[in-house]
C-alpha cells in the first residue's frame, strides 16, 4: 500500500478537486493513473460494497453509490449500515451486550404492539446449533438469551413448501393443500412445481396464512419471501411483499426488513417473513457434514447478527418478537444406497415422485387417475427382499401421526424411505450423494430448529420439543390477534410465555353419559354365547352379581383405574353408559354395541414373565346392556376373518374370580385374526414390560372408526356404509393410551406432577404384511410395528371424540403440553 | 346462489333516523362479513361499514359516530342504523358479502331520500 | 385513510377499440385492489381482484396490472355492453375500505 503520508481519501472520495500530500488523489481515474491515496480502496471503493461500517467509513462523507451510510447524518436520514453506532459511536454490539440488560419490553414509541418477525433458515438441522455453535455466534446468542426448544418437529414429508406453508397456517399439508413441492391435481388436472408459474394459482393454496390473519384483524404483514406470499390466497396478498429471487444478497433482504420497521406508525408492519435459503443448499450440495454447510452457517449467522444489530441500532432488539426457525433437517444420501422400482417390476408403467419421500400414481393422468391399481402396486413392493429399505403404504394405513391422507393431491402408493436411502424408478436417476430430506418426521436429522426472543418470550430457557403446526397460534397469540381454525392446539405452548395471552380450558362434555344399571343378575338372552365353566344358573348368577357394585367399590375403582378422570364424550348425540367393575371401567357406545374405552391401570409387577392365558371359550352376555344394544357370539362365527377381542385383558385378574368381570360381550371388540395376534402380544407382554419400567401404567384403549382417513372420527352415517352383513362396524384402528407418572417414586394413582405418556394409534388390518412377519416370531416385529404407530394423545382425542386427563390437577396448558407431545425413541442422526 | 335484498323505507325526514335491513337468501348469514354501501346519485361509492355474524362490527371512521349495524341469524338477515340523517345522506344503499377483500354478491340497492 | 384517484373521469372510445382506465393510491396497496363495472340502475359487478386476476365469468378482453400506488385496467376492444362506470377499491389498508370516484366508458 501506498505511504500514509501520501493524505487520506477520508471525507474526500470521488472529489475531483482533492489533492492529497504529495498530490495524491480520490477521483474516479486514479487508479488509472496510479496517484490514488493510500486508503483509496479501502475507503472509497470497499465502502460502497460492504453492509457495515468500519474505522475508514465512520464520518464518511455521503456516497451515492454505497449500500448504506457511516456518515455522520445518517441516523437522521435513517440510513446506517446495522452496526453504525456500534462501530462509529461505541455503544456496546448486540452480540457483545450481556442477556440481563433486556428485562422487560422496551419499545419506543409508537411501537404499542410488538412486532413479530418470522425468520426461516431453509434446512437447519437441530444438530447444526449444537455441533457447530461456536461457529455461529449471533445464533448461539439468541439461543442463550431467549427460548429455544431442543427442536421442533416438522410435518411430514420434511419438504420446504409444505411445511412453510404449515408454519404459517398451523394446517397439517393434507388440510393446507401444498402437499408436497411437486404434486398433480386430478379436479384441476395440473401440476404443481417450484419451478412453473402454475405454483402462483391460488387453486392450491388452502388455508388462512398468517399474513392474512393479521390483515383481517387491521393489522399490516410484509414478507421478506416465504412460500405463499406471492399468490392472491382469498384473493389477497401481504400489504408488503417482494418476489422471490434467490439472488438478493440476505445483507440486502434484512437491510430492507429493517427499512420496513422505520416506516410512519400507519404504514409500519407488525408482522414479517424473512426467508434464507441456506444452510440448505450448501446441505443438498455436500451433505449435512461438510465444510460447505460450515460456511453456510458462518453466512447466515453473520446476516442475522446484522439484524439483531439493525433492531439494536432502532432500540427495537427488546421490542421485537422474533421466532427463527427451519423448515426441516438434512440428512447425507449415498449412490449406493438407492431403491430401484425396476428392481421390483418388470416394466414402470406408472408415475412415480421420486426420493426420501416417494409417491406412485398412474402415468395417464386424468384418465386412469381414479381406477389405477394402488392394491396391487402395494402388494408387489411388500416384504420383497429381506434388507428391503422402504416400506410401501396406501397412505389411509400410514401411521395417522403423519396425517398425510385426506388430500386428492396424496397419491394412493407411498413409501416410506430408510434414512439416507432414496426409492426412485430406475438407474437412469442419478441424482444422489449430497444431501436430501422428506423423510420420516421423527428421524433426528430431520428435526429442524425452533429460538425465540422478544418482550413476550421467556429468557434463558429450554423447552421440549414440539410440532411446526403449533407455531401458528402462538404468532395469533403474540399479536393478540384471533386464529383462524388450525390443526394446532391453542394454549400448548403457552410455557414458551412470560404472561400467556389465551388461557385454555378443558372442553365442554357433548354427549351426556348414564350408568348401565344392574337390574337382574340373569341374562334375558345369552346373545349366542357359552361358558362351559359357568355350569349352572347359580354359578352365572355369582359371577353376574360382581358386576353390581356398590358406591365404595365404585369410588375405590375410579380411583385406581381412572386416576385422571374418565374420558369426556365430544361426539354429538352418542348414547353412553358407564360400566364399572372392580378392575376396570368402559364407556359402552350402544349404536357401536361396543365400548368406547376401556381403562385399567396395571400396576408394577414383580413378575415380568408374561400373563397366564385367559379361561378359553368362555363369553356371557353383560346383564346391564339390553341385548339390542349387545353384539351377539353368533357374528363371530360369521366372518372366517374376524374374531373378538377384548379392550380389557381378562389374564390381567387380581383374584381367580375377577377374569369373570372381562369375559363379556360389553368388553369385546371385533378384531382380524391376524391383528390380534399383536394385540395379545401386547398385552401379555409388552404392556407388562412397561408397568414394570414405569412403577405402574395407566391403560385407556378402544376402537377408532376413521374410514374417510381424514383423521377425525366418522359420523355415524360414514360407519354405517361400511358395516358388511352384520350388525357391527369394523374398527379402523385401535387406540392404547399409556400414562404413567414421570416421576417413576410415584405410581399413575398417586402422582403428584407431570405425566408420562405413550399414545399408539394402530391400523386393524387384516394381515400383518406392514411387518413382513412370515416365519418371525411376535418378539422381533409386534414391539417395533407398534412404535412406528406411536402418537399424540391430541391425535387419539381427534380420532375418538374423547377427551382426556379432565380431572388431572395441573393447569389445562400443561395438559395441552402432554397431550401434544409425541414419544420417539430415534437415537442416531 | 347467494341472493340479498335490501328493505326500507324510501323517504326519511331530516334529524330522524336511517334504517335499513338485507335479507339473505340462498345460504346462510354465518361466517362471512356482510356491509352497507351507499352511493348519493351521480356518484362514487362509499363503504358504511360491515359485521361479522357473531356480531363484530367496523365502520367508516367518517360515519361511525352515527352509525349502528346489527345481525339476526336466526333471520338470515342483518340491519343499517343511520342517526340524525341529512340531505347529504341521500343515495342508493346497497347490501352486499364481504370477506375483507371485495363485495360479491350485492343487493340491487334501495333509493333513500332525506327530505326536509 | 388511502385515496384513490381513477382517470380520467371520462373516457370516449370507439367500439372495438382499446381502453386503459387509471387508479392511483395515495400510499401503497401492494396488489389489494379490485375493479367494478357498473351499469346504470345496477349494483356493480366484480372484474378484477388481486390487482390482476379476473373474477369467474369475466371474458378475457378485461385484465389488470400494477402494483403499490399505480394500476390500469385494460379492456382490449370494447364490446357494446363494457360501456359503463368502473371502480376500483383498496382492501390492504382498512377500515374503511375505499373506492374511487369513478370512470365512465361512453361511446364515441
Known amino acids: 500500500r501506498k505511504l500514509e503520508k501520501q493524505g487520506s481519501c477520508r471525507k474526500k472520495c470521488f472529489d475531483a478537486s482533492f489533492r492529497g500530500l504529495e498530490n495524491c488523489r480520490c477521483d474516479v481515474a486514479c487508479e488509472d493513473r496510479g496517484d490514488c491515496c493510500w486508503d483509496f480502496e479501502d475507503t472509497c471503493v470497499e465502502s460502497t460494497r460492504i453492509w457495515t461500517c468500519n474505522k475508514f467509513r465512520c464520518g464518511e462523507t455521503r456516497l451515492e453509490a454505497s449500500l448504506c451510510s457511516c456518515s455522520d447524518d445518517c441516523l437522521q436520514r435513517k440510513d446506517c449500515c446495522a452496526d453504525y453506532k456500534s462501530v462509529c459511536q461505541g455503544e456496546t454490539s448486540w452480540l457483545e451486550e450481556n442477556c440481563d440488560t433486556a428485562q422487560q419490553s422496551q419499545c419506543p414509541e409508537g411501537f404499542d404492539l410488538p412486532p413479530v418477525i418470522l425468520f426461516s433458515m431453509d434446512g437447519f438441522r437441530a444438530e447444526y446449533l449444537y455441533t457447530w455453535d461456536t461457529l455461529m455466534p449471533n445464533i448461539n446468542k439468541l439461543k442463550t438469551c431467549g427460548i429455544h426448544s431442543k427442536y421442533m418437529r416438522a410435518m411430514y414429508p420434511t419438504k420446504t413448501f409444505p411445511n412453510h406453508y404449515t408454519i404459517v397456517t398451523g394446517l397439517y399439508p393434507e388440510s393446507h393443500g401444498i402437499i408436497d413441492n411437486n404434486m398433480y391435481d386430478v379436479n384441476l388436472n395440473k401440476n404443481f412445481s417450484l419451478s412453473s408459474e402454475e405454483q402462483n394459482n391460488p387453486a392450491w393454496w388452502h388455508g388462512q396464512p398468517m399474513w392474512l390473519t393479521a390483515m383481517y384483524q387491521g393489522l399490516k404483514a410484509a414478507t421478506y419471501f416465504w412460500p405463499g406470499s406471492e399468490v392472491a390466497i382469498n384473493g389477497s396478498f401481504p400489504s408488503i411483499y417482494m418476489p422471490y429471487n434467490r439472488s438478493v444478497p440476505y445483507e440486502e433482504r434484512i437491510s430492507t426488513l429493517l427499512k420496513w420497521l422505520d416506516l410512519p406508525k400507519a404504514e409500519r408492519p407488525s408482522f414479517y417473513t424473512m426467508y434464507f435459503e441456506e444452510p440448505d443448499s450448501s446441505g443438498h450440495a455436500s451433505g449435512p457434514v461438510s465444510a460447505r454447510v460450515i460456511k453456510a452457517l458462518q453466512v447466515v449467522d453473520h446476516a442475522f447478527g446484522m439484524l439483531m444489530e439493525g433492531l439494536k441500532q432502532r432500540n427495537l432488539h427488546n421490542c421485537v418478537n422474533i421466532i427463527l426457525l427451519a423448515d426441516h433437517g438434512m440428512d447425507q444420501t449415498y449412490c449406493n444406497k438407492m431403491e430401484y422400482m425396476t428392481d421390483y417390476f418388470p416394466r414402470i408403467n406408472f408415475y412415480m415422485y421420486e426420493g426420501p419421500a416417494p409417491r406412485i400414481r398412474a402415468l395417464n393422468v386424468p384418465h386412469d387417475f381414479f381406477s389405477f391399481n394402488s392394491e396391487e402396486i402395494v402388494r408387489n413392493l411388500s416384504c420383497r427382499k429381506p434388507d428391503q429399505h422402504f416400506k410401501p403404504y396406501l397412505t389411509p394405513d400410514l401411521p395417522k401421526r403423519l396425517h398425510y391422507a385426506k388430500n386428492v393431491r396424496i397419491d394412493k402408493v407411498h413409501l416410506f424411505v430408510d434414512p439416507q436411502w432414496l426409492a426412485v424408478g430406475s438407474k437412469s436417476n442419478t441424482n444422489c450423494g449430497g444431501g436430501n430430506h422428506g423423510y420420516n418426521n421423527e428421524f433426528r436429522s430431520m428435526e429442524a430448529i425452533f429460538l425465540a426472543h422478544g418482550p413476550s418470550f421467556k429468557e434463558k430457557t429450554e423447552v421440549e420439543p414440539f410440532e411446526n403446526i403449533e407455531v401458528y397460534n402462538l404468532m395469533c397469540d403474540l399479536l393478540r390477534i384471533q386464529p383462524a381454525p388450525n390443526n394446532g392446539t391453542r394454549g400448548s405452548l403457552n410455557h414458551l410465555l412470560k404472561v400467556p395471552f389465551y388461557k385454555p380450558s378443558h372442553a365442554e362434555e357433548v354427549s351426556k353419559f348414564s350408568v348401565c344399571g344392574f337390574a337382574n343378575p340373569l341374562p334375558t338372552d345369552n346373545l349366542s354365547c357359552l361358558c362351559p365353566h359357568l355350569q349352572n344358573s347359580i354359578q352365572l348368577e355369582q359371577v353376574n352379581q360382581m358386576l353390581n357394585l356398590t358406591q365404595e367399590e365404585i369410588t375405590a375403582t375410579v380411583k385406581v383405574n381412572l386416576p385422571f378422570g374418565r374420558p369426556r364424550v365430544l361426539q354429538k348425540n352418542v348414547d353412553n353408559c358407564l360400566l364399572y367393575h372392580r378392575e376396570y371401567v368402559s364407556g359402552f357406545g350402544k349404536a357401536m354395541r361396543m365400548p368406547m374405552w376401556s381403562s385399567y391401570t396395571v400396576p408394577q409387577l414383580g413378575d415380568t414373565s408374561p400373563l397366564p392365558p385367559t379361561v378359553p371359550d368362555c363369553l356371557r352376555a353383560d346383564v346391564r346392556v339390553p341385548p339390542s344394544e349387545s353384539q351377539k357370539c353368533s357374528f363371530y362365527l360369521a366372518d372366517e376373518n374376524i374374531t373378538h377381542g377384548f379392550l380389557y385383558p381378562p389374564a390381567i385378574n387380581r383374584t381367580s374370580d375377577s377374569q369373570y368381570d372381562a369375559l363379556i360381550m360389553s368388553n369385546l371388540v371385533p378384531m382380524y385374526e391376524e391383528f390380534r395376534k399383536m394385540w395379545d402380544y401386547f398385552h401379555s407382554v409388552l404392556l407388562i414390560k412397561h408397568a414394570t419400567e414405569r412403577n405402574g401404567v395407566n391403560v385407556v384403549s378402544g376402537p377408532i372408526f376413521d374410514y374417510n382417513y381424514d383423521g377425525h372420527f366418522d359420523a355415524p352415517e360414514e360407519i354405517t356404509k361400511h358395516i358388511a352383513n352384520t350388525d357391527i362396524p369394523i374398527p379402523t384402528h385401535y387406540f392404547v393410551v399409556l400414562t404413567s407418572c414421570k416421576n417413576k417414586s410415584h405410581t399413575p394413582e398417586n402422582c403428584p406432577g407431570w405425566l408420562d405418556v405413550l399414545p399408539f394409534i394402530i391400523p386393524h388390518r387384516p394381515t400383518n404384511v406392514e411387518s413382513c412377519p412370515e416365519g418371525k416370531p411376535e418378539a422381533l416385529w409386534v414391539e417395533e410395528r407398534l412404535t412406528a404407530h406411536i402418537a399424540r394423545v391430541r391425535d387419539v382425542e381427534l380420532l375418538t371424540g374423547l377427551d382426556f386427563y379432565q380431572d388431572k390437577a395441573q393447569p389445562v396448558s400443561e395438559i395441552l403440553q402432554l397431550k401434544t407431545y409425541l414419544p420417539t425413541f430415534e437415537t442416531t442422526i | 346462489q347467494v341472493q340479498l335484498q335490501e328493505s326500507g323505507p324510501g323517504l326519511v325526514k331530516t334529524s330522524e333516523t336511517l334504517s335499513l335491513t338485507c335479507t339473505v337468501s340462498g345460504g346462510s348469514i354465518s361466517s362471512h362479513y356482510w356491509s352497507w354501501i351507499r352511493q348519493p346519485p351521480g356518484k362514487g361509492l362509499e363503504w358504511i361499514g360491515n359485521?361479522?355474524?357473531?356480531?363484530?362490527?367496523n365502520y367508516n371512521p367518517s360515519l361511525k359516530s352515527r352509525v349502528t349495524m346489527s345481525v339476526d341469524t336466526s333471520k338470515n338477515h342483518f340491519s343499517l342504523k343511520l342517526i340524525s340523517v341529512t340531505t347529504a345522506d341521500t343515495a342508493i344503499y346497497y347490501c352486499?358479502?364481504?370477506?375483507?377483500?371485495?363485495?360479491?354478491?350485492w343487493g340491487q340497492g334501495t333509493l333513500v331520500t332525506v327530505s326536509s | 385513510e388511502i385515496v384513490l384517484t381513477q382517470s380520467p373521469g371520462t373516457l370516449s372510445v370507439f367500439p372495438g377499440e382499446r381502453a386503459t382506465l387509471s387508479c392511483r393510491a395515495s400510499q401503497s396497496v401492494s396488489r389489494n385492489l379490485v375493479w367494478y363495472q357498473q351499469k346504470p340502475g345496477q349494483a356493480p359487478r366484480l372484474l378484477i381482484y388481486?390487482?390482476?386476476t379476473r373474477a369467474t365469468g369475466i371474458p378475457d378482453r378485461f385484465s389488470g396490472s400494477g402494483s403499490g400506488t399505480e394500476f390500469t385496467l385494460t379492456i382490449s376492444s370494447l364490446q357494446s355492453e363494457d360501456f359503463a362506470v368502473y371502480y376500483c377499491q383498496q382492501y390492504n389498508n382498512w377500515p374503511p375500505w375505499t373506492f374511487g370516484q369513478g370512470t365512465k366508458v361512453e361511446i364515441k
Open positions: 352486499a358479502r364481504h370477506d375483507h377483500v371485495w363485495f360479491d354478491p
Open positions: 388481486g390487482a390482476s
Open positions: 359485521i361479522f355474524y357473531s356480531g363484530s362490527t
